[in-house]
């Protein structure tokens, strides 16, 4: 079952997601998607990072923390009721079936 997070209409929502880089700056790809995590990757991607930087994002979605240190928590700006639902944070640690995936439930009031 998903961990639940709450925010109010018009405020920013915060969905935490973290990993520990093997070494400082040794980043791994991360994707955030609207909807539960599928078998691979993310569905309906709202933001993604690669080994260096944030390389894809859509409006209102951003990383507020220091993603170079593994803080890939998602901030959603100025939320509406339509932002309610499940979000997937997937940390694509290289190797054989090494992904870490987290489904987070956002409730907007």
């Amino acid at each position: 079952s998903e961990v639940e997070y709450r925010a109010e209409v018009g405020q920013n929502a915060y969905l935490p997601c973290f990993y520990t880089p093997a070494a400082p700056g040794n980043l791994v790809p991360v994707c955030w998607g609207k909807g539960a995590c599928p078998v691979f990757e993310c569905g309906n991607v709202v933001l993604r990072t690669d080994e260096r930087d944030v390389n894809y994002w859509t409006s209102r979605y951003w990383l507020n923390g220091d993603f170079r240190k593994g803080d890939v928590s998602l901030t959603i700006e100025n939320v509406t009721l339509a932002d309610s639902g499940i979000y997937c944070c997937r940390i694509q640690i290289p190797g054989i079936m090494n992904d870490e995936k987290f489904n987070l439930k956002l409730v907007i009031k």
């Epitope: 078998v39 993310c42 569905g43 290289p94 190797g95």
Partner: antibody, heavy 121, light 107 residues
């Protein structure tokens, strides 16, 4: 246009090895996940392996894990499947397929024509 | 593993008929279901993903619906080229699994 061409199939004895290749053209190969899917003689489809666009992450079902290895050479636009310790139940038509992922993961939007692998003594 | 149970296994119909194929998942798969068409001697061709989104170039007579555990593929008016085998697949969790197929034959 998108083209995927498998090769390397054939007849192999139980316990043997085989390496399949899939040559890709008509799209930016390094921008897609890629998969192998097989179709058994009774026409059932089975997912075999998937690899990320960079090749850094790989995924397998338990039935082939530790026996099959998926890999890719983005410079050569080629996908591979190294198969070892082959069993009779691995007899199938093997297809490679493309998996878009960047804005939305979608499984297998283009398939090759397949290469036949027969495991028999 | 998630089992995708497809029904019917065989279906006889005529050109112009409306047909529906069903796929039931043994566990919740959200809308992570795809549908494929396979003609004899050919590779599978994708029709639908995300349960209801048609791939580019797929005729509008093909439609998908459902969420959770029950999914349907509907062909609104069968054309001669639609007689083929159809497979569903779930891509919600590993391993990705396919249904057993529905062979659509000319009555």
């Amino acid at each position: 246009q998108v083209q995927l061409q498998e090769s390397g199939g054939g007849l192999v004895k139980p316990g043997g090895s085989l390496k399949l290749s899939c040559a890709a053209s008509g799209f930016t190969f390094s921008s897609y996940y890629m998969s192998w899917v097989r179709q058994t003689p009774d026409k059932r489809l089975e997912w075999v392996a998937t690899i990320s666009n960079s090749g850094g992450s790989t995924y397998y079902p338990d039935s082939v894990k530790d026996r099959f290895t998926i890999s890719r050479d983005n410079a050569k636009n080629t996908l591979y499947l190294q198969m070892s310790s082959l069993k009779s139940e691995d007899t199938a038509m093997y297809y490679c397929a493309r998996d878009p992922y960047y804005t939305n993961y979608v499984p297998m939007d283009y398939w090759g024509q397949g290469t036949m692998v027969t495991v028999s003594s | 593993d998630i089992v995708m149970t497809q029904s019917p296994s065989f279906l006889s119909a005529s050109v112009g008929d409306r047909v529906t194929i069903t796929c039931k998942a043994s566990q919740y798969v959200d809308t992570y279901v795809a549908w494929y068409q396979q003609r004899p001697g050919k590779a599978p061709k994708p029709l639908i993903y995300s349960a209801s989104t048609r791939h580019t170039g797929v005729p509008s007579r093909f439609s998908g619906s459902g969420s959770g555990t029950e999914f349907t593929l509907t062909i609104s008016s069968l054309q001669p080229e639609d007689f083929a085998t159809y497979f569903c697949a779930q891509y919600s969790s590993s391993p990705l699994t396919f249904g057993g197929g529905t062979k659509l034959e000319l009555k």
